[in-house]
């Protein structure tokens, strides 16, 4: 079949997801792609404990992750509710400032500096995580 | 060592379909990302489609979308590209290649595909 | 779509001369390069990623530049081997785009 029971070469495995972080920067849109062809998706932190571990593998530098407001309201790529889940802004943030001078606010999310996040312009060129998760099904106990 | 071998190649008339296949061995087929690139005749190299390694997720070109379809079938190493209405201007060798970090690091030998009037 | 433009489009050289070509795109795209040679009849061959990470088994004497938009292809010592047509690629943004290639002649 096509379950996935172990995180491919230079993955991550963390918690049942499987984790890539990028050491070059691509726009939002481009990130969002890469993980797609990676059959995976921009990261979804959904828990402190997550968000912690992402921190500590990306270190002090600006990353996407897979949330933004393209359309409207706040969204995770893989559907995860946004109001109910996990959020980490910094403090006034999001703002979706325009004061940038590259036209429009900003979209989309990233973990800055400290781990807390902020909303930029989708079109900066920012490291990225794809995360994937470990099939649901080999979580399960073998039949006996 | 990665092998790449296209297929389905020919003549066709304008209008027409042909179905491309790539047979893939050497490597762990379903974990890359797989896409097709062209050539015209005399020219550069022109990039078509691309699909991951499960299937899931595929994208093209302009010049080909609506027209052309990537798919793939893991048990059997493979990778297709269905073409369908034809052009003059779809004439060229057609690739596939593997796709390594959004680059394309083997290639096959190429299969022509002529479309005449 | 990301434009990719190479120059020359045609350069004649000598066996062990320099040879350089460059490759502009048309917006950012870091370093986001391949580099690729096809010789006639053949498939292209990836010789360098990332716009200066030398693929295994490429030959020390071609070497990978720049960042941005400017970049720069360059062999050292031209042998053989390496008369050939030349492509860059850039890998930041679907459609993924390739200049109209360099061919590298004999004098």
């Known amino acids: 079949g096509s379950e996935r029971t172990c995180c491919p070469v230079n993955w991550v495995e963390h918690e049942r997801s499987c984790y890539w972080f990028s050491r070059s920067g691509k726009a939002w849109a481009d990130a969002d792609n890469y993980c797609r062809l990676e059959d995976a998706h921009l990261v979804v932190v959904t828990s402190w404990e997550e968000q912690k571990f992402v921190q500590h593998h990306i270190g002090p530098v600006n990353t996407w992750m897979g949330l933004h407001d393209q359309n409207g309201p706040w969204k995770w790529v893989d559907g995860t509710d946004y109001e109910t889940g996990f959020k980490n802004w910094r403090p006034e943030q999001p703002d979706d400032w325009y004061g940038h001078g590259l036209g429009g606010g900003e979209d989309c999310a990233h973990f800055t500096d400290d781990g807390r996040w902020n909303d930029d312009v989708c079109q900066r060129p920012y490291r990225w995580v794809c995360e994937t998760e470990l099939d649901k099904a080999s979580q399960e106990p073998p039949l006996l | 060592e990665v092998h790449l071998l296209e297929s389905g190649g020919g003549l066709v008339q304008t209008g027409g379909s042909l179905r491309l296949s790539c047979a893939a061995s050497?490597?762990?087929?379903?974990?890359?990302?797989m896409t097709w690139v062209r050539q015209a005749p005399g020219k550069g190299l022109e990039w078509v489609s691309v699909?991951?390694?499960?299937?899931?997720?595929?994208f093209y070109a302009d010049s080909v979308k609506g027209r052309f379809t990537i798919s793939r079938d893991n048990s059997k190493n493979t990778l297709y590209l269905q073409m369908n209405s034809l052009r003059a201007e779809d004439t060229a060798v057609y690739y596939c290649?593997?796709?390594?970090?959004?680059?394309?690091?083997?290639w096959g030998q190429g299969t022509l595909v002529t479309v005449s009037s | 779509d990301i434009q990719m433009t190479q120059s020359p489009s045609s350069v004649s050289a000598s066996v062990g001369d320099r040879v350089t070509i460059t490759c502009r795109a048309s917006q950012d795209i870091t370093d986001w390069l391949a580099w690729y040679q096809q010789k006639p009849g053949k498939a292209p061959k990836l010789l360098i990623s990332a716009a200066s990470s030398l693929q295994s088994g490429v030959p020390s004497r071609f070497s990978g530049s720049g960042s941005g938009t400017d970049f720069t292809l360059a062999i050292s010592s031209l042998q053989p081997e390496d008369f050939a047509t030349y492509y860059c690629q850039q890998a930041n943004s679907l459609p993924w785009t390739f200049g109209q290639g360099t061919k590298v002649e004999i004098k």
């Open positions: 050497g490597f762990t087929f379903s974990s890359y990302a």
């Open positions: 699909i991951s390694g499960s299937g899931g997720n595929t």
């Open positions: 290649a593997r796709r390594y970090g959004d680059y394309f690091d083997y």
